[in-house]
């Protein structure tokens, strides 16, 4: 039995998953900030997690997934305010009993040490200098994140 | 290039409705916010509300109880209406583009609607 | 959710420097850095000067700049033209999703 968020998350990643390929992402848009391979925005406004998650896909991107605590500590070094709180895209899974990102893989327990509870309508937020739990209804900001397309150099045989 | 285009009646009777329209040409509603605003003559700016293309709004606490927004996707457009209006809301009428929530990047030319018997 | 608080006019002579103060609360302008500024030329629709306190939207001449200390946010404008004689009107995120405008500046160029 998933939970309604957890639907909602399944929902909107099958609905990106159908669309029709775009040409890769070689620049960031207008107000997106490159780190490394990705763009990111980060909302101004606040919204609970499901809006925050369908806000994102709207804008042809999700919200943030994070692959490592170096990427974490990149991504927090541009958040600005130190109490500000932004959704990224991990939420508990009450059906797996575990975190799970919304591209259905779940938290590798060494990459994020997260402050809170692992339990029903929990979604994670990140702020400059903590990973934390809170209920997936409150309202705060998000951070969308868009792949840039790497340029690969052809690299020719030896003749 | 983003264009803006508010329509809508220019003369609405007092106690009834003001209903406009946002029509956005050169690029998709989708990817951002949009806001309405208004400025009666000779004064300043009043921020009345935004909406999300998932369909959430904000609206200014001041008008909330008197304001619905909506969008429509498909056809590029948003709208505003604006019930019980009295003669304080007589105004020019604008909407705009909001990317992030805080600013507004792309305005309509404005639509000035007189309320009046 | 009151205004923020503007002067009513500005001036200065052409190549001068001109600042127009916004101030509002611990509440908007100095709980956020989300300020922006604007310019309205008579009867037509305003027009984005400054966003994020003092990020400038690309077309808007170097000239035109923001910064904010405490509750107060400002928009100077160095090298004063003709052209940049019109309303300002400055605004700020207020928390819970709202906005707020100032009152408006006249600048005129003397």
């Known amino acids: 039995q998933k939970s309604s968020i957890e639907k909602c998350s399944v929902d909107i990643q099958q609905s990106r998953n159908k669309t029709t390929e775009r040409p890769g992402l070689l620049n960031c848009p207008i107000y997106w900030q490159q780190l490394r391979e990705k763009c990111l925005l980060f909302s101004h406004t606040v919204n609970p997690w499901n809006n925050s998650l369908a806000d994102c896909s709207t804008k042809e991107s999700s919200l943030l997934l994070i692959r490592d605590k170096d990427e974490l500590i990149h991504t927090q070094n541009l958040i600005r305010d130190k109490a500000i709180l932004f959704w990224i895209g991990l939420n508990f899974s009450l059906s797996e009993k575990n975190w799970k990102w919304i591209n259905g893989s779940f938290l590798n327990s060494n990459d994020l040490e997260i402050r809170g509870d692992a339990k029903e309508n929990s979604c994670i937020s990140i702020s400059q200098t903590s990973v934390y739990s809170e209920y997936c209804s409150t309202e705060i900001r998000w951070i969308c994140q868009k792949e840039l397309t790497p340029v690969r150099n052809k690299v020719y045989p030896d003749s | 290039q983003v264009q803006l285009q508010e329509s809508g009646p220019g003369l609405v009777k007092p106690s009834e409705t003001l209903s406009l329209t946002c029509t956005v040409s050169?690029?998709?509603?989708?990817?951002?916010?949009w806001s309405w605003i208004r400025q009666p003559a000779g004064k300043g700016l009043e921020w009345i509300g935004r909406?999300?293309?998932?369909?959430?709004?904000n609206y200014n606490p001041s008008l909330k109880s008197r304001v619905t927004m909506s969008v429509d996707t498909s056809k590029n457009q948003f709208s505003l209406k604006l019930s019980s209006v009295t003669a304080a809301d007589t105004a020019v009428y604008y909407c705009?583009?909001?990317?992030?929530?805080?600013?507004?990047?792309?305005w309509g030319q404005g639509s000035l609607v007189t309320v009046s018997s | 959710q009151s205004a923020l608080t503007q002067p009513p006019s500005a001036s200065g002579s052409p190549g001068q420097s001109v600042t127009i103060s916004c101030t509002g609360t611990?509440?908007?302008?100095?709980?956020?850095?989300?300020v922006s500024w604007y310019q309205q030329h008579p009867g037509k629709a305003p027009k984005l000067m400054i966003y994020?306190?003092?990020k400038r939207p690309s077309g808007v001449p170097d000239r035109f700049s923001g910064s904010k200390s405490g509750n107060t946010a400002s928009l100077t404008v160095s090298g004063l033209q003709a052209e940049d004689e019109a309303d300002y009107y400055c605004?700020?995120?207020?928390?819970?999703?709202?906005?707020?405008f100032g009152g408006g500046t006249k600048l005129t160029v003397l």
């Open positions: 705009a583009r909001d990317p992030l929530g805080s600013f507004f990047d792309y």
């Open positions: 605004s700020s995120y207020a928390g819970s999703n709202n906005l707020v």
């Open positions: 994020e306190v003092s």
């Open positions: 611990s509440s908007d302008v100095g709980g956020y850095n989300y």
């Open positions: 050169g690029g998709s509603i989708s990817s951002y916010y």
């Open positions: 909406i999300y293309t998932i369909g959430t709004t």
